[in-house]
Interface confidence: low
Amino acid sequence: FERTRSLQDPCSNCPAGTFCDNNRNQICSPCPPNSFSSAGGQRTCDICRQCKGVFRTRKECSSTSNAECDCTPGFHCLGAGCSMCEQDCKQGQELTKKGCKDCCFGTFNDQKRGICRPWTNCSLDGKSVLVNGTKERDVVCGPSPADLSPGASSVTPPAPAREPGHSPQ
């Protein structure tokens, strides 16, 4: 059915960058200014996204593809397709409703975005603290006395940081 319909439908011949213009006997017309169609056979063109204010244009709109935005310096993207821009903070801080706040003691943030995370608890793995944590850096766990046999690695790297809201695999 789908194949039969497309053979009969003159709009199916309209390529990306055009629309099937019912006002002109279903002739393929170029998309009007500031609009695009990314697939063929469309009866309308979509309005181009405008990257205004805190958004800036990463990729210009063309007749066949929408504009893509990113954020001006001092901000970073959030959401699918950079639907929001969120203020950056310094390393060692997190963004709260009242602005950027330093990480509480016992937590750190080594990025300009995201939340402060607790330092790794070395003792849970039977390790000891080799390098103390700071607001910007996690602790570095050292070996337990039992690990100091010849050939053993002397430092265990910290667990990889996880993005907030992601559960471990």
């Epitope: 960058g17 002109r24 200014p33 063929g40 007749s63 066949t64």
Partner: antibody, heavy 119, light 110 residues
Framework: QMQLVQSGAEVKKPGASVKVSCKAS????????LHWVRQAPGQGLEWMGI????????TYAQKFQGRVTMTRDTSTSTVYMELSSLRSEDTAVYYC????FGSGSFDYWGHGTLVTVSS | QSVLTQPASVSGSPGQSITISCTGT?????????VSWYQQHPGKAPKLMIY???NRPSGVSNRFSGSKSGNTASLTISGLQAEDEADYYC??????????FGTGTKLTVL
């Protein structure tokens, strides 16, 4: 940089056809429209039509319907404008111009091609 | 489709401001914010000066500005300079997916 290079001047007899070319460079050819605009000696600008460089679809000014054909060759980034059944009043400079995408304007223009129709 | 109406000529002295009008209908100038203005020196191709009613492309002097009210668009040139002497054309997108130019205005700098 962005360039639209047009073919050279032509002299034609009434009733003949002329085909003017416009080679684009310096931008992604298939992402933009190209327009054709003409200007008779001492007269104003006259919009003739638009071609979508990727799909090849066209829209022509009503005045030129049936006499003008716009085509493109994506392999050479070239658009063509053919005008048939020439008459003396078609004597003009013919310009190709890029459609400034996201806007109803023409941001880059070719240098123009003079077509003279004379018996 | 009919052309947009512009005054045939305007003039001004260096340093003065001048305004060129461009009158259409609700199917073109009044219906869309897609009015543009072009400057053309003798023997040269037109150059885009204003697009989308009031936006200046990079490289165009901020002495050039555009506006629109109803079916009439306007181009204002302030601090007139000798090199501004040229022909000026407006253009608009139309409801029939076509474009239309104005009749053209000759600007003379006295």
């Amino acid at each position: 940089q962005m360039q639209l290079v047009q073919s050279g001047a032509e002299v034609k007899k009434p009733g003949a056809s002329v085909k003017v070319s416009c080679k684009a460079s310096g931008y992604t050819f298939t992402s933009y429209y190209l327009h054709w605009v003409r200007q008779a000696p001492g007269q104003g600008l006259e919009w003739m039509g638009i071609i979508h460089s990727s799909g090849g679809s066209t829209t022509y000014a009503q005045k030129f319907q049936g006499r003008v054909t716009m085509t493109r060759d994506t392999s050479t980034s070239t658009v063509y404008m053919e005008l048939s059944s020439l008459r003396s009043e078609d004597t003009a400079v013919y310009y190709c111009a890029r459609g400034y995408f996201g806007s109803g304007s023409f941001d880059y223009w070719g240098h123009g091609t003079l077509v003279t129709v004379s018996s | 489709q009919s052309v947009l109406t512009q005054p045939a000529s305007v003039s001004g002295s260096p340093g003065q401001s001048i305004t060129i009008s461009c009158t259409g209908t609700s199917s073109d100038v009044g219906g869309y914010n897609y009015v543009s203005w072009y400057q053309q020196h003798p023997g040269k191709a037109p150059k885009l000066m204003i697009y989308d009613v009031s936006n200046r492309p990079s490289g165009v002097s901020n002495r050039f500005s555009g506006s629109k009210s109803g079916n009439t668009a306007s181009l204002t040139i302030s601090g007139l300079q000798a090199e501004d002497e040229a022909d000026y054309y407006c253009s608009s997108y139309t409801s029939s997916s076509t474009y239309v130019f104005g009749t053209g205005t000759k600007l003379t700098v006295l």
